[in-house]
């Protein structure tokens, strides 16, 4: 019967008595940087070309016995997970292996860099179809390794890496912390994060998504027909490399940004038990388990968005945090979050010719996060309209006044330390389609975009008193682009998007009593693109 | 293609004319930075990736590497250039004493230097 991991990533329409999705990634080449591999194992023979690249450190210990099957174990298994005949994800993908890990599974940053350079040079000498690079390894945070990954990604290569097996924040490791790399955590058959001895999968904002990574059946280097079960974030990353190969084989023109958005979009949502993660990491960790798209084509009409969290600002009075979108993505909205509730909001600002989302800490605050909503919006022309604090009036408002521009997000930023001491009026204007409304002492920023066929609408959900969180979701066919809180009292910890739901978190004051002034409203801006929908219908 | 031996002779002469043999300060007055792995057991001191500024050409990378070797030799240090990077990042991989880091950080074109460290199968 089909192994649990292949079943988990397969949409129901492909599930028969065996895993046989269409197009096994035959147009794609997957580079594997790992240990040596048994390339003529029955499961992968003819699918893996062993390059002559080898850059590994000496094995530790004077009495180390080099046993071929042990040297090949990790890489052979991963090659099998990516493209194995019987237990592989992308059965049609061809692979090339580079040896950067020794028989103990240890390598160096420098060896990995030289390996990545080798791939880039190969790509220049003999350009082929789409390339996926699988990096099933991790070391401490490395500026140079992250930089090399960024360069390779900007050359059109898709890099997929293991989040790491340290039960820790993936941002502390490389290449997991490189924003351009697709970083994969591991889950098990019960959709629980994988525990590995006393440790387990890494987590946090640097993880893009999770994938099966426990008890994964794959080729064993013990013999040419052997299989073995292995666990780890390497196995999880291998699943995503396989899925990426299949998506790219079906749509070879996909950019890295488009591929990442699709991986996120087609993932199973909210199935991971977050209690396993440290409490402060739960909100930052994506609750996504990778899956193949239900069909290889036809996703083009969708407006894809994802949420990008910044690093923590730190607690100093003037500390700020910045969240950035990928080069091919548009920043459609910006929000902020602070566990202490002490923050001074957020704003969208230009940095190096691109909009970024900056959140501001407040005096006495433990720090803030900036949360960017990053979307794929072809031919978009977006700008930020700002209204300074209205002071005396009912509240500050700003709208999109340019012809054909629609509101995709609202942000507010204030200089006063605590808006809660400056109570807003009880009666406040309702949100209007092209208008942002905020506290009278805050400056309000509207993200206004013009793109072919783009239409947006505002959805609100308010509750009379803060009860931890308020949510509002966009309906089927619409994509959440903006998420903010109205009016932004001291009880509000912040707002952020989780998939297609806008979440506004506030301090639970149900025990201390509350007034109607402390009502909290979650405001979602939901958009869709008629242009993309029409374009995809014309293709079919 | 420039005459590399010529470059090297020119380099040595230039170094001899410097009072204490220190390299010229980096351009634009920016200071190159040094990075190393936060996890001590994973550090590999003695091997360093010298990353040069983005637009540095291969010939400049080679020249900078040779310059470092020449200056180190004058101080009685042996260095070995293990690899010259080009294609992704400009720079070079060097085996040298950590005592030379201050010197290396002052070389022209240097953006930052990172001590090598271990990576592990996951």
């Amino acid at each position: 019967s089909i192994p649990w991991n292949l079943e988990r990533i397969t949409p129901p329409r492909y599930r028969a008595d065996e895993y046989q999705p269409p197009d096994g990634g035959s147009l794609v080449e997957v580079y594997l940087l790992d240990t040596s591999i048994q390339s003529d194992h029955r499961e992968i023979e003819g699918r893996v070309m062993v390059t002559d690249f080898e850059n590994v450190p000496e094995e530790d210990g004077t009495r180390f016995h080099r046993q071929a099957s042990k040297c090949d174990s990790h890489g052979t298994h991963l090659a099998g997970v990516v493209s194995g005949r019987d237990a592989g994800v992308a059965k049609g993908a061809s692979m090339r292996s580079l040896r950067v890990l020794n028989c103990q599974g240890k390598g160096t940053v420098s060896g990995t860099l030289i390996g990545l350079e080798f791939i880039r040079k190969s790509q220049l000498v003999q350009p082929v179809g789409p390339l996926v690079v699988l990096l099933p390894l991790a070391g401490g945070y490395s500026r140079v390794l992250n930089a090399a990954c960024q360069r390779l990604a900007r050359a059109g290569v898709v890099l997929v890496t293991a989040a790491g097996n340290f039960r820790d924040d993936a941002c502390l490791y490389s290449p997991a912390s490189a924003p351009e790399v697709i970083t994969v955590g591991a889950t098990n058959a019960q959709d629980q994060p994988v525990t590995l001895g006393t440790l387990g999968t890494n987590f946090g904002r640097c993880v893009d998504l999770f994938a099966p990574g426990e008890d994964i059946i794959g080729a064993s280097s013990d013999c040419s027909t052997c299989f073995v079960s292995q666990s780890g974030t390497s196995q999880a990353a291998a699943h995503v490399a396989g899925i990426a190969a299949m998506m790219l084989s079906a749509e070879p023109e996909l950019t890295l940004a488009e591929l990442r958005q699709r991986l996120i979009h087609f993932s199973a949502k909210d199935v991971i038990n977050e209690a396993w993660f440290p409490e402060d990491q739960r909100v930052l960790t994506p609750n996504l388990v990778a899956a193949l798209p239900p069909s290889t084509h036809g996703a083009g009409w969708q407006l894809f968005c994802r949420t990008v969290w910044s690093a923590h600002s730190g607690p100093t009075r003037m500390a700020t945090a910045i969240a950035r979108c990928a080069p091919d993505e548009e920043l459609l909205s910006c929000s902020s979050f602070s566990r202490s509730g002490k923050r001074r909001g957020e704003r969208m600002e230009a940095q190096g010719g691109k909009l970024v989302c900056r959140a501001h800490n407040a005096f006495g605050g433990e720090g803030v996060y900036a949360i960017a909503r990053c979307c794929l919006l072809p031919q978009a022309n977006c700008s930020v309209h700002t209204a300074p604090p209205a002071e005396a009036s009912m509240g500050t408002r700003v709208h999109c006044h340019q012809q054909g521009h629609v509101l995709t997000g609202c942000s507010s930023h204030w200089e006063v330390e605590d808006l809660g001491t400056h109570k807003p009026p009880v009666l406040r204007p309702r949100g209007q389609p092209n208008q942002c409304v905020g506290h009278r002492e805050a400056s309000i920023h509207a993200s206004c975009c013009h793109a072919p066929g783009l239409e947006c609408k505002v959805k609100e959900h308010g509750i009379p008193a803060p009860q931890g969180q308020v949510t509002v979701a966009c309906e089927e066919g619409w994509t959440l682009t903006g998420c903010s809180a109205l009016p932004g009292t001291s009880h509000v910890l912040g707002a952020y998007a989780v998939d297609n739901t806008c979440v506004v978190r506030s301090r639970d004051v149900s025990t201390t009593g509350s007034t109607s002034e402390e009502a909290v409203t979650a405001v979602a801006i939901c958009c869709r693109s008629r242009h993309l929908a029409q374009a995809s219908q014309e293709l079919q | 293609q420039e005459d590399e031996d010529g470059d090297y002779e020119e380099l040595v002469l230039a170094l001899r004319s410097e009072e204490d043999g220190l390299a010229e300060a980096p351009e634009h007055g920016t200071t190159a930075t040094f990075h190393r792995c936060a996890k001590d057991p994973w550090r590999l001191p003695g091997t360093y990736v010298v990353v040069l500024k983005e637009e540095t050409h291969l010939s400049q990378s080679e020249r900078t590497a040779r310059r470092l070797q020449a200056q180190a030799a004058r101080r009685g240090y042996l260095t070995k250039i293990l690899h010259v990077f080009h294609g992704l990042l400009p720079g070079f991989l060097v085996k040298m004493s950590g005592d030379l880091l201050e010197l290396a950080l002052k070389l022209p074109h240097v953006d930052y230097i990172e001590e090598d460290s271990s990576v592990f199968a996951q």
Epitope: Q38, D40, G46, R85 | -
Partner: antibody, heavy 115, light 109 residues
């Protein structure tokens, strides 16, 4: 192009041994092992075993285990199959084929065992 | 006695379609995606026609197709031609080895 070239026909007496060679060319040798298959006159195909060109590991069919030895000479890209204690029912055409997938075949070597 | 069962012979007229079956168990055909079909003309080595159940190597006519259901694999040849007359063998992985069918003689009438 991908080619497997086998040695010539052999006539052997019962109890003797035969060693058939198979020279591979035109592909990355370590990406595939070599399978050996035999076909008795007018009969079907019988898989005898496999040898790794990568590390020399072998996987023999139970029926010939103990009588067969497969070896490789990587310097000449040649694989050998030796069958010992020959019997008359070992008379067959012996083929080498690329890998377990057997996508490319040698031309065959006729081995006749007769007293 | 071959591990996989094939009909001893099948026949068809030019232009017709024929199907050859290959029945095994869930330890071979049913358990793996690696069923292959070979064509063998007299005095020649076998030639791979279908691999991994349904894939055609380059250069093989699209008149040849393969499929599998449960423990039975099938080879279908459409638009029969005189040169298709040959012996056809199926093969499959087992957990540690390879097995062949006994072969099917295809006669083009």
């Amino acid at each position: 192009q991908v080619q497997l070239v086998q040695s010539g026909a052999e006539v052997k007496k019962p109890g003797a041994s035969v060693k058939v060679s198979c020279k591979a060319s035109g592909y990355a040798l370590t990406s595939y092992g070599i399978s050996w298959v035999r076909q008795a006159p007018g009969q079907g195909l019988e898989w005898m075993g496999w040898i790794s060109a990568y590390n020399g590991n072998t996987n023999y069919a139970q029926k010939v285990q103990g009588r067969v030895t497969m070896t490789t000479d990587t310097s000449t890209s040649t694989v050998y199959m030796e069958l010992r204690s020959l019997r008359s029912d070992d008379t067959a055409v012996y083929y080498c084929a690329r890998g377990y997938g057997m996508d490319v075949w040698g031309q065959g070597t006729t081995v006749t065992v007769s007293s | 006695q071959s591990a996989l069962t094939q009909p001893a012979s099948v026949s068809g007229s030019p232009g017709q379609s024929i199907t050859i079956s290959c029945t095994g168990t869930n330890s071979d055909v049913g358990g793996y995606n690696s069923v292959s079909w070979y064509q063998q003309h007299p005095g020649k080595p076998p030639k791979l026609m279908i691999y991994e159940v349904s894939n055609r190597p380059s250069g093989i006519s699209n008149r040849f197709s393969g499929s599998k259901s449960g423990n039975t694999a099938s080879l279908t040849i459409s638009g029969l031609q005189a040169e298709d007359e040959a012996d056809y063998f199926c093969s499959s992985y087992t957990s540690t080895s390879m097995v062949f069918g006994g072969g099917t003689k295809l006669t083009v009438l």
